[in-house]
Every structure is written in structure tokens, then in C-alpha cells.
């Protein structure tokens, strides 16, 4: 797009560039132990890693941002690794009347890109 | 959302937190001088600044990310400042038959949040 082409191979070495990673967290970590019943331990996937020039660029804006960061690093930040999509998860909540299930569409990352 | 509440006031001082900023760029900067027409420098708006705890959190995932970054800073990165929306802009392209207009929906940021 716009005559700059994103790339998918990491020039920094395996596991260094923007990717999805699983992080373990307890309800206590999240401050949720008073209102979520289960799961007690959450497997959360998050986007981690660096965004070197043109790697997994989200869109035209990210391609431009990468280019300008190379020219004006103090003024324009490098693109950073953020979710491109999410996977829905269900949490079991305590409620006044007992227990309910609630789906969260934006809690667990499913894919990552550099924006 | 999810018992964590994003906030909109910057604890780091004016202009330090995630916000929209206008950046000037030439066609040469972008590598576009052979295929885009422009008599002036281009103005681009980009998302810059830090994302301190719970500031302008994009969604539940970002709220959790902020919390876990506080607990596991080496493992979980802080949220970062990225576009929440874009504004469509028009570029004048050189073509074989002269000049044409093309709209880009993802080139200029319109709003920012921490993801």
C-alpha cells in the first residue's frame, strides 16, 4: 500500500519481533477476585516484541510512521506491537442474584501487528 | 469496564501523555516524489506520548495489560499510543495518462488511545 511494503520476517532474530505470547495471570493479579468466580487462573494472550522497520505494518499510517521514525526518531515514535484482533472469552461473575456468564470480546488478543 | 477505569488526565504533565500531534513531511521523506504530486509539505497527524497506568485505555485488554505491566514489567509491555481512528485524505497521483485522485482511509490519524 502506498508504495511501501510491510514484511513478515523478523530481522532481529527469533522471538524478538512483534508476536502473540501467552501470559498467566490470577484473579488477584487483575484485582478481580471479588467479582469473578472462574477461571481462577487466566491464560491471556498479549502482543509483545519490537516493531523494526516495516515489520507487520498494520496499515499505510504505520508504514509512514516507520519511515518517519527512521528520519525523525526524537519526534516520531516507532510503530508498536498491539492486537490486530481479539478472541471472545467467557467469565463467570458473581452478581447480587447469584452467578452469571459474561462474554468479553476485547480481553484476549488473537493476532498482533505494528501500529 | 471490567472494574478498572481508564482515565483522561495526564499524570506526567501537559503534552507528555498519548495525544495527536501534527508532523510535517516531504514527498522525499516518504519516498513518494516519483508518484505523488504536492506543491507543499504534507501534514500528517500521528499518535505520540506515553501511556501511564490506565490513561486512555483502548479497551479491557489494554486495562489488563496496564495492570500486568505493573506486576511483570519485564514480561508485559506497557500499553502504547496508537490511532483509535483515522480521517480519510486524498492524494494526487501521477498516472500514465496524467493525474488522478485516490482516497486513503488509513493514512492520517484522527484520534489516539493506549492499546
Amino acid at each position: 500500500s502506498a508504495h511501501l511494503h510491510p514484511r513478515d520476517s523478523c530481522p532481529l532474530g527469533p522471538g524478538r519481533c512483534c508476536h502473540l505470547e501467552t501470559v498467566q495471570a490470577t484473579l488477584e493479579d487483575l484485582g478481580w477476585s471479588d467479582w469473578v468466580l472462574s477461571p481462577r487462573q487466566l491464560q491471556l494472550s498479549m502482543c509483545v516484541g519490537e516493531c523494526p522497520h516495516l515489520y507487520r505494518s498494520a496499515n499505510t499510517h504505520a508504514l509512514i510512521k516507520a519511515r518517519l521514525h527512521g528520519l525523525q526518531p526524537d519526534r516520531v515514535p516507532a510503530p508498536c506491537c498491539v492486537p490486530s484482533s481479539y478472541t471472545p472469552v467467557v467469565l463467570m461473575h458473581r452478581t447480587d442474584s447469584g452467578v452469571s456468564l459474561q462474554t468479553y470480546d476485547d480481553l484476549v488478543a488473537q493476532g498482533c501487528h505494528c501500529a | 469496564s471490567a472494574h478498572l477505569h481508564p482515565r483522561d488526565s495526564c499524570p506526567l504533565g501537559p503534552g507528555r501523555c498519548c495525544h495527536l500531534e501534527t508532523v510535517q513531511a516531504t514527498l522525499e521523506d516518504l519516498g513518494w516524489s516519483d508518484w505523488v504530486l504536492s506543491p507543499r509539505q504534507l501534514q500528517l497527524s500521528m499518535c505520540v506520548g506515553e501511556c501511564p497506568h490506565l490513561y486512555r485505555s483502548a479497551n479491557t485488554h489494554a486495562l489488563i495489560k496496564a495492570r500486568l505491566h505493573g506486576l511483570q514489567p519485564d514480561r508485559v509491555p506497557a500499553p502504547c499510543c496508537v490511532p483509535s481512528s483515522y480521517t480519510p485524505v486524498v492524494l494526487m497521483h501521477r498516472t500514465d495518462s496524467g493525474v488522478s485522485l485516490q482516497t486513503y482511509d488509513d493514512l492520517v490519524a484522527q484520534g489516539c488511545h493506549c492499546a
Partner: antibody
Framework: QVQLVQSGAEVKKPGSSVKVSCKAS????????VSWVRQAPGQGLEWMGG????????NYAQKFQGRVTITADESTSTAYMELSSLRSEDTAVYYC????????????????WGQGTLVTVSS | SYELTQPLSVSVALGQTARITCSGD??????VSWYQQKPGQAPVLVIY???NRPSGIPERFSGSNSGNTATLTISRAQAGDEADYYC??????????FGGGTKLTVLG
């Protein structure tokens, strides 16, 4: 549906200033370029300048440089055009017009127009 | 500064084809837009980027542009097409330039 609603007609003395407003509704105000175009009685269209709220910058036609100030208030989705040192030749209908942001050119392709504001300069 | 020259007036018989020209130095390498303005009303964009029409503008309106002349063509002219027509482009520093306008009269 996009609408541009301008302030009412004005009668001004030579040497004074006039400020005309243009309130936008429908669409995202900051995402477009707003220009001011005037038309003297029986004459053609003349571009005066414009502003792009998202960039916060205004550009002016050379003819009006130093005499016109164009501003925008995003909180009210309103653009303003102030013309100073008025003379009789400034008697005209003043239009605000909206178009997409054209990178490097900024203004043009005016797809929505206000109803016009008649400014009469007379002693 | 860049100048666009239009004929002051053009007449066309009802149902026939009207052509309104806009002359400028090497205008064929410019993007040109056309506006229609009826008496007492604000202008309306009818053609942009050679021959693109905004929604609501009939297919009878088309544009072309080459050399030193851009042309707005209105086929099967109707009484409601009677109006002033303005071409628009940009000068070398990116400022908006309008032509002087052409009054279209539909006869019959």
C-alpha cells in the same frame, strides 16, 4: 446528512471588521477541510483561504494574506472567517465550503456549502 | 498565478448537448472540478477528477481534460440545467483557483 449553517447578513462601515461563522453538523468536523469562498454581486467565485481542524493550520490566498483570519472551534464544530480593514469592494456573499483533506493541496473538491452570508460594506 | 478562462455564456437547445470549456496552461496535467450555481443558491459540485460525479448528479454530466482545455459536457440539456458553471483547479503553490464562470442558457 452534512449541513453547514452560516451566521446572518451583516452591514459594516469601511475600515471595520466582520466575523462570519459556519456551524457544521453531520460528519466529523475535524476530519475535513473548511474553506471560505466569496462572490461579489454579479461576479465569480473567489477562494479566500481555509482551515483543517485536525492539523490546526490555516492557509490563505495571497490576495487576502494579512487581512483575513480563519479559525475553528472543534468543541462547537464551527469555523470562523474574520476580514479586517473592510472596503466597499468587499461587499459580497461569503460562503463556507467543506471538502476532503487533499494532502499537500489541502483545499478543493467542495462537496458541501453553507447557504452564504451577505456582507455589505457601506458608509 | 494560474488563470482559468471560461466563455461568458453558452447557449444550447433543449435536449441537445452543451459543452462548456475552461482553458489554462497545460490544464490537462491538472485535476479539474466543476460547480453548478443557480441564481440565489450556493454552488454544487457536479464533476471532479476528470469525470467523477458526486452522488445525486445525473449521468448526463461528464468531464474531459487534455492539453490546454478542460470541458464540461451536459448531454440532453434540460431547462433545470440553466445555471452558472465554474471550473476549479490549483495553482503552482496549491491555492484554489476558479474560472470566471459561464452562464448556460437552455433555449426552447
Amino acid at each position: 446528512q452534512v449541513q453547514l449553517v452560516q451566521s446572518g447578513a451583516e452591514v459594516k462601515k469601511p475600515g471595520s471588521s466582520v466575523k462570519v461563522s459556519c456551524k457544521a453538523s453531520g460528519g466529523t468536523f475535524r476530519s475535513y477541510a473548511v474553506s471560505w469562498v466569496r462572490q461579489a454581486p454579479g461576479q465569480g467565485l473567489e477562494w479566500m483561504g481555509g482551515i483543517i481542524p485536525i492539523f490546526g493550520t490555516a492557509n490563505y490566498a495571497q490576495k487576502f494574506q494579512g487581512r483575513v483570519t480563519i479559525t475553528a472551534d472543534e468543541s462547537t464544530s464551527t469555523a470562523y472567517m474574520e476580514l479586517s480593514s473592510l472596503r466597499s469592494e468587499d461587499t459580497a456573499v461569503y460562503y463556507c465550503a467543506r471538502g476532503p483533506i487533499i494532502m499537500g493541496y489541502q483545499f478543493g473538491l467542495f462537496d458541501h456549502w453553507g447557504q452564504g452570508t451577505l456582507v455589505t460594506v457601506s458608509s | 498565478s494560474y488563470e482559468l478562462t471560461q466563455p461568458l455564456s453558452v447557449s444550447v437547445a433543449l435536449g441537445q448537448t452543451a459543452r462548456i470549456t475552461c482553458s489554462g496552461d497545460n490544464i490537462g496535467s491538472h485535476i479539474v472540478s466543476w460547480y453548478q450555481q443557480k441564481p440565489g443558491q450556493a454552488p454544487v459540485l457536479v464533476i471532479y477528477d476528470k469525470s467523477n460525479r458526486p452522488s445525486g448528479i445525473p449521468e448526463r454530466f461528464s468531464g474531459s481534460n487534455s492539453g490546454n482545455t478542460a470541458t464540461l459536457t451536459i448531454s440532453r440539456a434540460q431547462a433545470g440545467d440553466e445555471a452558472d458553471y465554474y471550473c476549479q483547479t490549483w495553482d503552482s503553490i496549491g491555492s484554489v483557483v476558479f474560472g470566471g464562470g459561464t452562464k448556460l442558457t437552455v433555449l426552447g
